[in-house]
């Protein structure tokens, strides 16, 4: 007996969709082996129509998919736009078609929906609109038109042409009588509710010569689309509810016990605290469609989500909705990385960002999540040499360590840098991760002078003091530019005197610029690293001026100005124009990210995500 289990018979009608769920024992081998859906032939073979390895037969192109849910031990075959040609005997199975690990499914597609015993069948989704058409003869053209609903044995008046509307339909029903040429009246019901389903009778006239027409209204809750995403990854819910609700408030909610649906985010500014820092509701298009992105997926995010439209910004009876069942795969391909990174004012952080290692050539981005309105994430830096103007000299995106991880370094930290940041690429949109930067009490570990002025043609020596805790780290100086930080030669000057309670292992490492030129002006960083993993950095701006007196300049900590709490870039710095993203795949649905790179840096409150995965500014 095969251990595969599914529905034995599936019956539907032309034009409809089916979702066929097949169960299998969730052993390690079964979870990863090929899943297939095949059609049994007259001679006993079984021709594959779709498989989990990406094969889709031309018969199913554009209308079918197969999704595996390894943790549940199920896979689901969705087939849309059914025709009577799809009727037949099928198998859902594992491995090779002929090996017997399969289950027989009979699919029967009949004609319809249409007239059934002279009853017109209307099948409409919850929250949508139905138009019931009622023909009549000329002799009843001037007579009363009405629509009744069969409740038990008795017809109850819903609406008529004299102006009566049943209280259950107030504000969402109308009766239209077509022009004199057409012998037809229509009843339009909006914001359909489940309770609207049933048998209706429309009538023209009230005597024995009246014209009658039966209608069967079926109101469907949408079947949830199954979505399976990796722990720590991201999910995007695309919600298209139709132009008729383009100007109505939109929401995404998560079903809790029973019929309750707790708002996750809505266009009225509400956002559930559990999603702070990791959700964006992207602006809607003219047709009313919108999308919601959630990053940093957690185990507890799994569940049924509904998007909908209602003036209250939450689920109400009659809201048009779309549904998803989100499964979060705990056997994630996305590696663990700290969700909280801590730094001190004036100090720095080095953030490790994972990406899909198969996409090493993709463009990497880092953006700052902003909670205002529906959430947005203006880009701060990318791997193509663009850095937001306000971050010049203190932000760098490095491709190291590579092989699935890039590094973002932010220094000269202030309290305004606290907040949530997203790592992303223009490749696999599922690999978006969130990190929270927290600014904590303390002093920066690296000590450098504040403002330094060099003289043209002379020599400049800039010191950087490293405490003994970094004795085993590689120490470096580099010159910052938009594409990274180019390493420069430096000299170890022996133990530093800048630290109390610090032994011979502290170090003073100097940067020497010989025969200073105008090209030497700019930002210089000193820092520590271990292999390709970066730790703390400190930044110094070197200005270059004309010679006043001969000699070289040796800058000490005492002589230098103290670093200001926040660097305000003067007008001499080139503002990089708002650079459009070249790859159209990046956030096609998330315009806020691409269109708002030039937004000013606003004040942000940090919200504690309660994560235990934290990292200090200098740790790996």
């Amino acid at each position: 007996k095969s251990p595969i289990f599914g529905p034995e018979e599936v019956n539907s009608v032309e034009g409809n969709s089916v979702s066929i769920t097949c169960y299998y024992p969730p052993t390690s081998v079964n979870r990863h082996t090929r899943k297939y859906w095949c059609r049994q032939g007259a001679r006993g073979g079984c021709i594959t129509l779709i498989s989990s390895e990406g094969y889709v037969s031309s018969k199913y192109a554009g209308r079918a998919n197969l999704t595996n849910f390894p943790e549940n031990g199920t896979f689901v075959v969705n087939i849309a736009q059914l025709s009577q040609d799809d009727s037949g005997r099928y198998k859902c199975g594992l491995g090779i078609n002929s090996r017997g690990l399969s289950f027989d499914v009979s699919l029967e597609v009949s004609q319809g929906p249409g007239l059934l015993n002279d009853t017109k069948v209307y099948t409409v989704d919850l929250g949508r609109t139905v138009t019931i058409n009622c023909p009549f003869k000329t002799e009843n053209a001037q007579k009363r038109k009405s629509l009744y609903k069969q409740i038990g044995l008795y017809p109850v008046l819903v609406i008529d042409s004299s102006g009566y509307v049943n209280p259950n339909y107030t504000g969402r029903i109308r009766l239209d009588i077509q022009g004199t040429g057409q012998l037809l009246f229509s009843v339009v019901i909006n914001q359909l509710r489940l309770s609207d389903a049933g048998q209706y009778l429309c009538q023209a006239g009230d005597d024995s010569n009246s014209n009658k027409k039966n209608a069967d209204l079926q109101v469907l809750k949408p079947e949830p689309e199954l979505v399976y995403e990796d722990l720590r990854g991201s999910v995007t819910f695309h919600c298209a509810l139709g132009p008729e609700v383009a100007n109505v408030a939109k929401f995404l909610c998560r079903q809790s016990s029973g019929e309750n649906c707790d708002v996750v985010v809505n266009t009225l500014g509400k956002r559930a605290p559990a999603f702070e820092g990791r959700i964006l509701l992207n602006p809607q298009d003219k047709d009313g469609s919108f999308s919601v992105v959630i990053t940093g997926l957690r185990k507890e995010d799994a569940g049924r989500y509904l998007c909908g439209a209602h003036s209250d910004g939450q689920l109400q009876e009659g809201s048009p909705i779309q549904a998803w069942q989100l499964f979060v795969n705990e056997e994630s391909t996305i590696p663990r990385s700290p969700t909280v990174v801590k730094g001190v004012a004036g100090g720095s952080v080095a953030v490790l960002c994972p990406y899909n290692r198969k996409e090493s050539k993709s463009i990497k981005y880092w953006c700052l999540w902003e909670g205002a309105q529906n959430g947005r994430c203006p880009l701060l830096v990318d791997s193509e040499g663009w850095v937001k103007a306000q971050y010049e000299g203190r932000l760098s995106l490095l491709e190291e360590p590579g092989n699935g991880t890039f590094t973002v370094i932010l220094n000269q930290l202030t309290s305004r840098d606290a907040g949530f940041y997203w790592c992303l690429t223009n490749g696999d949109t599922l690999w978006r991760t969130t990190v929270e930067i927290k600014i904590i009490e303390g002093e920066p570990n690296l000590k450098v002078p504040g403002n330094v002025t060099a003289v043209l043609g002379e020599t400049l020596k800039v010191p950087c003091h490293f405490p003994c805790k970094f004795s085993s780290y590689e120490k470096y100086w580099c010159k910052w530019n938009n594409t990274g930080c180019q390493a420069l030669p430096s000299q170890d000057e022996g133990p530093s005197k800048a630290f109390v309670n610090c032994d011979e292992n502290s170090r003073l490492v100097s940067l020497t610029l010989n025969l200073v030129t105008r090209a030497d002006e700019g930002w210089y960083w000193c820092g520590v690293k271990q292999g390709h993993f970066y730790g703390e950095t400190a930044a110094v701006y070197v200005a270059v001026e004309e010679r006043k007196a001969a000699g070289s300049r040796d800058v000490s900590l005492a002589k230098a100005d103290a670093a200001p709490d926040e660097k305000v870039l003067d007008s001499g710095f080139r503002e990089i124009e708002n650079k459009a993203i070249q790859d159209p795949r990046l956030f096609a649905e998330e315009k806020a990210v691409a269109d708002t790179r030039d937004q000013a840096d606003g004040s942000r409150a940090s919200v504690d995500s309660g994560s235990s995965e934290e990292q200090g500014g200098s740790s790996r």
Epitope: P7, V10, N11, S12, P113, V121, T123, L194
Partner: nanobody, 127 residues
Framework: QVQLVESGGGSVQAGGSLRLSCQVS????????MGWFRQARGKEREGVAC??????????WYDDSVKGRFAISQDNTKNTLYLQMNSLKPEDTAMYYC??????????????????WGRGTQVTVSS
């Protein structure tokens, strides 16, 4: 208020057939699950056959023990659910219940999904 009333039970010899009916009233939705369950004396209630109905689409599921012998069907015009039982065996002896509940994704043979139950009809198969 949903009401489910079963009928068609009785005594039959092994190898014989019975057809159970379940008259459903008060159900307005066009999206729900309906099923036949049974409970033998001293045993737990178990799913036999069920049907997920989503408008004009339906999915029929059977327990392994009855596959090929029992068939579930419905007649919408009469608001009736049926269970045709052929090749009956003594181990099919039990009280048979009709149940209705929220539409389910995937199989519908699990008890917790059902909110409305009939009072049951007894089926006895003697050898």
């Amino acid at each position: 208020q949903v009401q489910l009333v079963e009928s068609g039970g009785g005594s039959v010899q092994a190898g014989g057939s019975l057809r159970l009916s379940c008259q459903v009233s008060g159900y307005t939705g066009s999206q729900h699950s309906m099923g036949w369950f049974r409970q033998a004396r001293g045993k737990e209630r178990e799913g036999v056959a069920c049907i997920n109905i989503n408008g004009m689409t339906s999915y029929k599921w059977y327990d392994d023990s009855v596959k090929g012998r029992f068939a579930i069907s419905q007649d919408n015009t009469k608001n009736t659910l049926y269970l045709q039982m052929n090749s009956l065996k003594p181990e099919d002896t039990a009280m048979y219940y009709c149940a209705a509940g929220r539409y389910q994704l995937g199989h519908c043979l699990a008890l917790p999904a059902y909110t409305d139950w009939g009072r049951g009809t007894q089926v006895t198969v003697s050898s």
